[in-house]
Interface confidence: medium
C-alpha cells in the first residue's frame, strides 16, 4: 500500500531512508537535456522474495536531441560527482536497514540521472532525519518517521527532533545565526500529519502501476 502523504517536514532538517521497503518506486528521472528512452521504464520497483530484494527495471536516459541512441547505464565518474549527495553527513548512522529482509538498498546512479531522486514510499517505510549544516539537533525522542496504516488511512509518525541554530547555544563572538529556511511550513499547517488526502490511492500498488493515477502519456 502506498503512503498517500509525505513524511513530515522538520524545519532546518532533511530526511533519508537507509533502505527501501519492497513496493517502493523510484522515478526514472533524467537531468536537463536528457529524457527516458522511448520504451524505458517510468520507475524502478523494489521487489523480492523472503531472502533477497532488488530493484526491478533499469532507468535509461538519452539525449533529448537524439532519437534512437541509448546511453549506457553505468555512470561516468564526472556524472556521479554531478549528482547532489543525499547521504547523511552525520557519523551517527542508524543500523544498516538494508540488511533487513524485504528491503532494497539505495540503487546505484544511472548515467545522466536527475540531480534529485523521487521516491514513492509504502506502508512500513522508515526515514531518518538530520539537521542541515549550521543547525544542531535537540532530541526529545527518535529522529525518525514511519509510514503507518491506521483505520484504513496512511500517516507518518512525527519525528521528535528540533533543529536549532548553533548561535543560540554557542558562546563564540561574531558568529552569525543561519538564516531561516524560506521553505518552512507555515504554522497553520503544523497539525496536518494525521490528515490524509481526499484522493487516496485505495487500490493495490501492483494494480495501479500503469494507471492514470500516476501516469499520463504524451499525446
Amino acid at each position: 500500500e502506498l503512503c498517500d502523504d509525505d513524511p513530515p517536514e522538520i524545519p532546518h532538517a532533511t530526511f533519508k531512508a537507509m533502505a527501501y521497503k519492497e513496493g517502493t518506486m523510484l522515478n526514472c528521472e533524467c537531468k536537463r537535456g536528457f529524457r527516458r528512452i522511448k520504451s524505458g521504464s517510468l520507475y524502478m520497483l523494489c521487489t523480492g522474495n523472503s531472502s533477497h530484494s532488488s530493484w526491478d527495471n533499469q532507468c535509461q536516459c538519452t539525449s533529448s536531441a537524439t532519437r534512437n541512441t541509448t546511453k549506457q547505464v553505468t555512470p561516468q565518474p564526472e556524472e556521479q560527482k554531478e549528482r547532489k549527495t543525499t547521504e547523511m553527513q552525520s557519523p551517527m548512522q542508524p543500523v544498516d536497514q538494508a540488511s533487513l529482509p524485504g528491503h532494497c538498498r539505495e540503487p546505484p546512479p544511472w548515467e545522466n540521472e536527475a540531480t534529485e531522486r523521487i521516491y514513492h514510499f509504502v506502508v512500513g517505510q522508515m526515514v531518518y532525519y538530520q539537521c542541515v549544516q549550521g543547525y544542531r539537533a535537540l532530541h526529545r525522542g527518535p529522529a525518525e518517521s514511519v509510514c503507518k496504516m491506521t483505520h484504513g488511512k496512511t500517516r507518518w509518525t512525527q519525528p521528535q527532533l528540533i533543529c536549532t541554530g548553533e548561535m543560540e547555544t554557542s558562546q563564540f563572538p561574531g558568529e552569525e545565526k543561519p538564516q531561516a529556511s524560506p521553505e518552512g511550513r507555515p504554522e497553520s499547517e503544523t497539525s496536518c500529519l494525521v490528515t490524509t488526502t481526499d484522493f487516496q490511492i485505495q487500490t493495490e500498488m501492483a494494480a495501479t502501476m500503469e494507471t492514470s493515477i500516476f501516469t499520463t502519456e504524451y499525446q
Epitope: 520507475y43 523521487i118 514513492h120 529556511s181 496536518c192 488526502t197 484522493f199 499520463t216
Partner: nanobody
Framework: EVQLVESGGGSVQAGGSLRLSCAAS?????????MAWFRQAPGKERDFVGS????????SYADSVKDRFTISRDNAKSTVYLQMNNTKPEDTAVYYC??????????????????????WGQGTQVTVSS
C-alpha cells in the same frame, strides 16, 4: 517532463467566485510534483498565490488570498485547482500554474518562490470588476 495548461479564467464581479484548473500532461508520474498558482498583474512581479504538496497533504497561501482562495488537486485527473471566492478587483491578473519536482531527500512541503518552480503553464486571464 510535465506540461501544464490552465483554464477557467474569465470575468467576474467583485464578491463572485471562479474556479481555475490546471491540467498536467507528459509521460511522467504526476504525484512527483508539488504544484502552485502564481499571478501577475499588469506591470507587476509574478507573485505567489498558493501551493500544494504532491499528495495534497500540505498547502500554503499568500496572506492576500488566505480564507478566500483554496488550492486542491486530483492526482487521478492530473489536475490542480484554484477556487477563488469573494473576489476583489485587486485579484485581476494573469494566473499561472507551476510545478516543482518533489525530492525525497531534500524535502520541503511547500515552496513559495517562483525560482523554485521548473515548469510553468501559459497563464489564464482573470478580471474582477467592481
Amino acid at each position: 517532463e510535465v506540461q501544464l495548461v490552465e483554464s477557467g479564467g474569465g470575468s467576474v464581479q467583485a464578491g463572485g467566485s471562479l474556479r481555475l484548473s490546471c491540467a498536467a500532461s507528459g509521460r511522467t508520474l504526476y504525484s512527483s510534483y508539488g504544484m502552485a498558482w502564481f499571478r501577475q498583474a499588469p506591470g507587476k512581479e509574478r507573485d505567489f498565490v498558493g501551493s500544494i504538496s504532491r499528495y495534497g497533504t500540505y498547502t500554503s497561501y499568500a496572506d492576500s488570498v488566505k480564507d478566500r482562495f483554496t488550492i486542491s488537486r486530483d492526482n487521478a485527473k492530473s489536475t490542480v485547482y484554484l477556487q477563488m471566492n469573494n473576489t476583489k478587483p485587486e485579484d485581476t491578473a494573469v494566473y499561472y500554474c507551476a510545478a516543482y519536482t518533489y525530492s525525497g531527500s531534500f524535502y520541503s512541503t511547500v515552496k513559495t518562490h517562483r525560482d523554485e518552480y521548473q515548469y510553468w503553464g501559459q497563464g489564464t486571464q482573470v478580471t474582477v470588476s467592481s
